[in-house]
Structures are given as C-alpha cells and as structure tokens.
C-alpha cells in the first residue's frame, strides 16, 4: 500500500515518500520509483533556510541605504541577509524593513538602556538622589552632588531635573563675615578719628556776625581732591555716587520725566 505519512525530512507525492531538499538547495524534480529527489544549489543572491520542496529559492533581503539600512550579516545560500540600522537609528519592526531615529530622554529622565540598531532608547524617571537636566539619547540620571564630601552644606535641594546647590557651612561663613565686619568697623573708626582731629584743630572766629546765617560745615573740605565749591553728590541706594549734572541746581528734585 502507498504510504500515508513519511519520515522526517521527507514529503509525500504520487504515493511516494521523497527526500526534501537540504537548506541552500531548491527542488528540481520529485523522486520517482527509480530516482532520488533532485535538488540544485541556490544562486549567489538567493537562499533557502529549511529542508524544503521549493522550486525557487528566496531572494536575499536588500538593505536599502535610503531607508537607513545597512548589512549586518551577508546572506548565504542557507541564510537571509540581516539588515541593521545606521548609527543613531533603530529598526521600526522586528523584520527591520526601515529605520527611525533613536528617541532622547527628556530632562527628569535618564537612559536606562542605550538604543541599538534594533531597539530604541529605554528611558527611566530619575529616582530621588538623581537628576538629568538635558535631553539626551545617551546620558543616564546623574547623582546629586554630595555637598558633605566637599565640606559644604545643601543650600538648595535637588530635583529630578536639577542638581543640589551647595554652600559654605555656618562656621565657614563666620570666618568670612567677621573679618569683613571688622574691616568696615576699622574704616569707620578711622574716619571718626580724622573728623575729631579736624574739629579740634579749627580756631573759633570771635568776630560778630549777627545777621549771618549759620554756615554749613563741610567735613570734606580738607580731604585731598575735594572741591568745596562743587555741589554735593547725590547717591543712589546702591551706594554708587552720582555726579551732579552741569546746568542743574543741586536740590532734591521731583521725579524727572523720562
């Protein structure tokens, strides 16, 4: 009786079990009662990757550079060409027929897995203690700066998008502030001493001036570079002196119109 089923690597045709063609070969003719299955090797640009009874080999996949593809592995008579994407791109699908650019992880997110030719960037939110302030396809979440290791203290807490801001500790701040204050006090004392000395030196005028209005004492008269005739300088709240403009009276003015 003719067989109803055949062994592995065989197929049933015309009541006969014929050998399948091995990978890399195509079927030319079925076996007969007197002959084996006839197979022929696939040509250079073709392949068959299984035991088969195909009369035509499959064409190797073409890695189209216009779609961002390049050859990762050249095809053989038994394997198809494997395409991958150019640098900065990854496959759109498992079959890798075209490529798309890798996505970047936004600020607050870091790269968990860098993209490859076949997979996109995997991002993850930066956990507490880490931050990312850039949009990047490569950068992971970076740890907050450790102020302690620099003998500094946290002045501003970090977020998932910003690093902590470190500042000097109170003891350090004191070491800076105290000398400055002492310096300022020293300058003030110096000025006071100079003033007292001036007042003590000046002789009193005995001549009567009954109608004369009391004169304004100009403490700066004897200071080098001072001009008693010049109008007194105005000062802004920033302590920067502002020279009196020519042609204007020296008086406290109403807000000037712009």
């Amino acid at each position: 009786e003719p067989p109803t089923a055949c062994r592995e690597k065989q197929y049933l045709i015309n009541s006969q079990c014929c050998s399948l063609c091995q990978p890399g070969q195509k079927l030319v003719s079925d076996c007969t009662e007197f002959t084996e299955t006839e197979c022929l090797p696939c040509s250079e640009s073709e392949f068959l990757d299984t035991w088969n009874r195909e009369t035509r080999c499959h064409q190797h996949k073409y890695c189209d550079p216009n779609l961002g593809l390049r050859v990762q592995q050249k095809g053989t008579s038994e394997t198809d060409t494997i395409c991958t994407c150019e640098e900065g791109l990854h496959c759109m699908s498992e079959s890798c027929e075209s490529c798309v650019p890798h996505r970047s992880c936004l600020p607050g997110f870091g790269v968990k897995q860098i993209a490859t030719g076949v997979s996109d960037t995997i991002c993850e939110p930066c956990p507490v203690g880490f931050f990312s302030n850039v949009s990047s396809a490569f950068e992971k979440c970076r740890p907050w700066t450790s102020c302690e290791t620099k003998d500094l203290v946290v002045q501003q807490a970090g977020t998932n998008k910003t690093d902590v801001v470190c500042g000097p500790q109170d003891r350090q701040r004191a070491l800076v502030v105290i000398p400055i204050c002492l310096g300022i006090l020293f300058v003030i004392l110096l000025l006071v001493l100079v003033f007292i000395k001036k007042v003590a030196k000046k002789p009193n005028d005995k001549a009567p001036h009954p109608k004369q209005e009391p004169q304004e004492i100009n403490f700066l008269d004897d200071l080098p570079g001072s001009n008693p005739a010049a109008p007194v300088q105005e000062t802004l709240h920033g302590c920067q002196p502002v020279t009196q403009e020519d042609g204007k009276e020296s008086r406290i003015s109403v807000q000037e119109r712009q």
Partner: antibody
Framework: EVQLEQSGPGLVKPSQSLSLTCSVT?????????WNWIRQFPGNKLEWMGY???????NYNPSLKNRISITRDTSKNQFFLKLNSVTTEDTATYYC?????WGQGTSVTVSS | DIVLTQSTLSLSVSLGDQASISCRSS???????????LNWFLQKPGQSPQLLIY???NRFSGVLDRFSGTGSGTDLTLTISRVEAEDLGVYFC?????????FGSGTKLEIK
C-alpha cells in the same frame, strides 16, 4: 494512463544505423523521469542502453561506447534511439521504457 | 559494473505454494540517502516486462499483495506467497542505484 508506443524498422544492415522512435502519451517527457532504451537478446538477457532525462541530459551504458545517441522532440513528446555501426550482435528486441511503463518492444534483426 | 546474480535459473512450484526468488548484488545498492533502488519485474511469455516491486519492498500500483520484496543492500528476495497460474514467466531484478543500470539474468517460474 501512461503509454509508450514504439516504431522503427525490424531489419537493419550491418554497419548501418539503427533508429527507433518512442511516442509517449498520458505524460510529458519534460515533467520528470528517465526515458530509457533497453534491449533483450535471444536467451532473455536484458541490457540497459541509456536514458534521456526530463531535462534533456543523457546517460549511456559505457559498453556501447560512442555508438549510441538518445534524443527527443518535446513538441511531439517523443524520444529516439540511434545506434551506429551495428553488427549481428545488436540483433535483439528493443524496448523504450520509463521502467514502470514499457513499450511493446521492437524486434530488430541485423543482417545483410 | 554491478553484477546481479540470480542463482536459480528455473523454479518449479505447485499452485498455492510459496516461491522465493533470490538476487545477490556484487556491491551494496544502498545510496547515501539510505535508499536501495532494487526493482523486480515479471515478463510473461510474449509480453514486455512489468514492474512488480520498486525500492526493495514497495509494491507497484495494481500489484497483488501476494508479491512482497525483502532484503538489504546486497541480498534481495522476491516472495510469492501463494503461486497462481498467471504468475508464470521470467522474474528479473534490476538495480538503478548505480550507472550503468544492470539486470539479473532472470529466474523462470514454472508450475508443477
């Protein structure tokens, strides 16, 4: 139903060529199989002479040296035997066969 | 060339009896795929040979199950389980594993 029908002369003079035709019906000779010529000498001894394959390629019995040629006409679904320089030793019944199906046989006598 | 020896030239059996016909090859007929292309034919008087068994043990379509083939690469046997009158004729083995194809000399089955 596959059928093979033979035709050709039954008498050939020594040193001449023997030519036989096999007409196939019910199956195309270009589809598959080997299309053989076999002869049977007096006393029942069988000898395979050669074949033409479905693809037109040949294989011959080395004992027939360069005397044999098997050709075909695919448009008529026929294949042919030509045996050159025959001698009386070539006297036999000639069969065309696919092996599972055989022609009726042609008795050929080589005599002057 | 491969020589197929059918040592029994003639076999005489009674109707209903079993007959075994042997064919021995000078070398293995098994090919690299594990197939053995050994066939059995019956040639009835005045007829062309007809295929009974192919590839050692496969019955050709229409062949009765009284006919069976067994054997390995070099020793092959055709068995007729219950001989009938229509079975008489000459039985040939033919190998088509190696070119040139070769036939056995034949075993004549006669009825007692």
């Amino acid at each position: 139903e596959v059928q093979l029908e033979q035709s050709g002369p039954g008498l050939v003079k020594p040193s001449q060529s023997l030519s036989l035709t096999c007409s196939v019906t019910g199956y195309s000779i270009t589809t598959n199989y080997h299309w053989n010529w076999i002869r049977q000498f007096p006393g029942n001894k069988l000898e395979w002479m050669g074949y033409i394959k479905y693809d037109g390629s040949n294989n011959y019995n080395p004992s027939l040296k360069n005397r044999i040629s098997i050709t075909r006409d695919t448009s008529k679904n026929q294949f042919f035997l030509k045996l050159n320089s025959v001698t009386t030793e070539d006297t036999a019944t000639y069969y065309c066969a696919r092996l599972d199906y055989w022609g009726q046989g042609t008795s050929v006598t080589v005599s002057s | 060339d491969i020589v197929l020896t059918q040592s029994t030239l003639s076999l005489s059996v009674s109707l209903g009896d079993q007959a075994s016909i042997s064919c021995r090859s000078s070398q293995s007929l098994e090919n690299s795929n594990g197939n053995t292309f050994l066939n059995w034919f019956l040639q009835k008087p005045g007829q062309s040979p007809q295929l009974l068994i192919y590839k050692v043990s496969n019955r050709f379509s229409g062949v009765l199950d009284r006919f069976s083939g067994t054997g390995s690469g070099t020793d092959l046997t055709l068995t007729i389980s219950r001989v009938e009158a229509e079975d008489l004729g000459v039985y040939f083995c033919l190998q088509v594993t190696h070119v040139p194809f070769t036939f056995g000399s034949g075993t004549k089955l006669e009825i007692k």
